[in-house]
């Protein structure tokens, strides 16, 4: 007997689709080996139709896929647009050839069944309503009209024109006629449930001259739509329940044995497991809404249902839509820490991943807010200016091509704690989230700027120093001038070869920035920071105010244009083997963001079109040069 297991018989009808799951034993070899689906011919040969190596036969082109779920030890073959030609014997199996471990599957595709001509079939989804049309002859116009439901022995009254209504249809069934047409009556039944399915007879008149019509009402549970998503990516449940429930509260719930536990609804309920990574967005007035979940976890896999009811809870007889979500652990989205810790007054540098194939996409950073239905207003973006309340302390550094951009937030307060999302206007699967935790600082910051109350005098020379600990010696130090389009790194070049000294004097490690001469445009926020290659570390910020020179102060001759601003970077040289990676704050954003929010992001990006990306030249009118001096103490 084969250790592979699956459905022995699969039957469907033309135009439908099948999803065949094959189970394999839990071994590392099995998880990584080739998976295939082949069709058995009369000769016993099995011709590959699709395999996990990327092969897809011509007859399956555009209508089939094969997905491996190594964490579940399963693979799934999805085939759409079935025809009777698909009827046959197949194998699902593992191995480099089609003679490996396999399981026989018989697939039968039949024609759509013909319906008896004397019966009118109504097919409706659960929770919807049906209007049954009952024609009759003129002579039965004055007679009683009725609809009854067939049971084993009799036909049980549903409703009649004398206003008799079966108790289980009270408030749900209506018998009426339209306009002046005296040859048809109608029965409307709302909030359909499974129990309403069956055969009905509508009748006008009594005895042999009565008009009768057979009706077959089929009430379908909605098909669960299959969703295959990668670990750490995001999923959007698009729910379209129809205009009749447009004004009802909406919900998304997850099946749990006998109940469906609400994850989020429009009345403000939200499952704590989804805190920081879920949004519910009403789309329009037609009952359409969507729920976005980001940072997918393995345990998010399952059976989801959306619906509408005034209670915001699942209710029988109300429309629903269902999905079966699979979460594939073989994910292209890098695994990063999902929690970043900072301290008050300190800074964090958050590395946001994006699809490396989309390096030119616009990058954004937003803060998830849970009030109401949840939303994520953009705080900064490659073409979106920094929000006012983040002036001087937030910047986005785009590093084209390497699949990461960095967001730096400094001057942290406890109010900054919360959930943030990294997103782009490109591949929506790469939305990621991080939780920022901010603790009260218990020691001095690693980077300190002096003087702290910086006021520079117009036309004079002004120097600020940034003190850093020995552990940052081997890292690159930089100063940048902040603007709401980014933090423009001030250029520098190293004029002396690095030397090392045995001891490290904590008090003498500093990098200085000199403005010479000071101009009005120099006013603003400046950051001192450390980085290693493209990996940004800690930063600290200082605001430099520029004042007119007071009387009696010495006059400084303006220097030539090239030397108007000089940034002198001075460093104490220490043993480069000391390098602690502390407080690196490279998080694991777990993917997210909402379509509508992204749309808004796009609109905002249009409004705030900047001349250059954050981290590149920000259009300053002055050039800066810098020198690297090494002092030995």
């Amino acid at each position: 007997k084969s250790p592979i297991f699956g459905p022995q018989e699969v039957s469907s009808i033309e135009g439908d689709s099948v999803s065949i799951t094959c189970y394999y034993p839990d071994t590392s070899v099995n998880r990584h080996t080739r998976k295939y689906w082949c069709r058995q011919g009369a000769s016993g040969m099995c011709t590959t139709l699709i395999s996990s190596n990327g092969y897809l036969s011509k007859e399956y082109s555009g209508r089939a896929n094969l997905i491996n779920f190594p964490e579940n030890n399963t693979f799934v073959i999805n085939i759409e647009q079935l025809t009777q030609d698909d009827t046959g014997s197949y194998k699902c199996g593992l191995g480099t050839s089609n003679r490996g471990l396999s399981f026989d599957v018989s697939l039968e595709v039949s024609q759509v069944p013909e319906l008896p001509s004397d019966t009118h079939v109504y097919t409706k989804d659960i929770g919807r309503n049906v209007t049954i049309e009952c024609p009759f002859k003129r002579e039965n116009a004055p007679s009683k009209k009725s609809l009854c439901k067939k049971t084993n022995q009799s036909c049980e009254l549903v409703i009649d024109s004398t206003e008799k209504v079966n108790p289980s249809y009270i408030g749900r069934a209506k018998l009426f006629m339209k306009g002046t047409d005296l040859t048809v009556f109608y029965v409307n039944i709302s909030h359909l449930t499974h129990n309403d399915a069956g055969l009905y007879i509508c009748q006008a008149g009594e005895g042999p001259s009565a008009d009768k019509k057979n009706v077959d009402l089929q009430v379908l549970a909605p098909e669960p739509e299959l969703l295959y998503k990668d670990l750490r990516s995001s999923v959007t449940f698009e729910c379209d329940l129809g205009r009749e429930v447009a004004n009802e509260a909406k919900y998304l719930c997850r099946m749990n044995k006998e109940t469906c536990d609400v994850i989020i609804n429009t009345l403000g309920k939200r499952d704590p497991d989804f805190e920081g990574r879920i949004l519910i967005t009403p789309k329009d007035d037609n009952g359409r809404f969507s729920v976005l979940i980001t940072g997918l976890r393995k345990e998010d896999a399952g059976h989801y249902q959306c619906g509408a009811h005034s209670s915001g809870l699942p209710q029988e007889g109300w429309p629903i839509q269902t999905w079966q979500l699979f979460v594939n652990e073989e994910s292209t989205i890098p695994n990063r820490r999902s929690v970043v810790k900072g301290v008050t007054g300190g800074s964090v540098a958050i590395a946001c991943p994006y699809n490396p194939k989309e390096s030119s996409s616009l990058k954004y950073w937003c803060r998830w807010e849970g009030d109401g239905n949840g939303h994520c207003p953009v705080l900064v973006g490659t073409q979106a200016q920094v929000q006012e309340e983040y002036e001087g302390r937030l910047a986005l550094f785009d590093q084209p091509g390497n699949g990461t951009y960095t967001v730096i937030l400094n001057q942290l307060t406890t109010e900054d704690a919360g959930f943030y999302w990294c997103l782009t206007n490109g591949d929506s699967r790469w939305r990621t989230t991080i939780e920022l935790q901010v603790a009260e600082a218990t020691r001095e910051p690693n980077l300190e700027v002096t003087p702290q109350n910086a006021t520079a005098v117009l036309g004079e020379t002004f120097t600020v120093s940034c003190h850093y600990p020995c552990k940052f010696y081997s890292q690159e130090k930089y100063w940048c001038k902040w603007s709401n389009k980014g933090c423009h790194i001030l250029p520098s070049h190293d004029e002396g070869a690095r030397q090392s000294s045995v001891s490290c004097d904590q008090s003498s490690q500093l990098v200085s920035m000199t403005l010479n001469p000071v101009s009005k445009e120099d006013e603003g926020w400046y950051w001192c920071g450390v980085k290693q290659g493209q990996t940004y570390g800690e930063t600290t910020a200082i605001y430099i105010a520029v004042e007119e020179r007071t009387r009696g102060s010495s006059h400084v001759n303006p220097t030539d244009a090239n030397a108007r601003a000089k940034v002198a970077l001075e460093e104490e040289v220490v043993d480069s083997s000391i390098s602690e990676k502390e407080n690196k704050a490279i998080p694991n954003p777990g993917p997210f963001a909402n379509e509508r929010e992204i749309q808004n992001v796009g609109d905002q990006a249009q409004e705030n079109r900047a001349s250059g990306d954050a981290g590149s030249a920000d259009g300053q009118s002055r050039s800066s040069s810098s020198k690297h001096h090494h002092h030995h103490h």
Epitope: F5, P7, Q8, E9, V10, S11, S12, I13, D16, S17, V18, S19, I20, Y23, N72, T74, I126, H194, L220, A221, E223, P224, M255, K257, E258, C260, G302, H303, Q305, E316, T322, Q324
Partner: nanobody, 126 residues
């Protein structure tokens, strides 16, 4: 709540046939699979057959020990699942339980089923 009621068990000779029925009632909205398990005296409950459905598509799963002899089917309108057992053997003697649930994972696993019937006894004498 879903209620499952089995019927059709009894005493038969080896080689004979028997048809078991399982009728589901109640909130069957999220039931996408129904199946049969059996438990012989002193043994663990084991998978026999399951039928899963999705719209007009049916998936039938069988244990190796019953392949070719047992057939599972369902009547959608009646919310009923049947197990046609042919060529019965003495080793098929057991209490047969009907099970139902969303069955999103492996249909051979007991935990995939949310609801269980009381069981019907099938005895096959040699």
């Amino acid at each position: 709540e879903v209620q499952l009621v089995e019927s059709g068990g009894g005493l038969v000779q080896a080689g004979d046939s028997l048809r078991l029925s399982c009728a589901a009632s109640g909130r069957t909205l999220t039931t996408y699979g129904m199946g049969w398990f059996r438990q012989a005296p002193g043994k663990e409950r084991e998978f026999v057959a399951t039928i899963k459905w999705s719209g007009s598509t049916n998936y039938k799963y069988y244990a190796d020990s019953v392949k070719g002899r047992f057939t599972i089917s369902r009547d959608n309108a009646k919310n009923t699942v049947y197990l046609q057992m042919n060529s019965l053997k003495p080793e098929d003697t057991a209490v047969y339980y009907c099970a139902a649930g969303t069955v999103l994972g492996d249909p051979r696993v007991l935990n995939e089923y949310d609801y269980w019937g009381q069981g019907t006894l099938v005895t096959v004498s040699s």
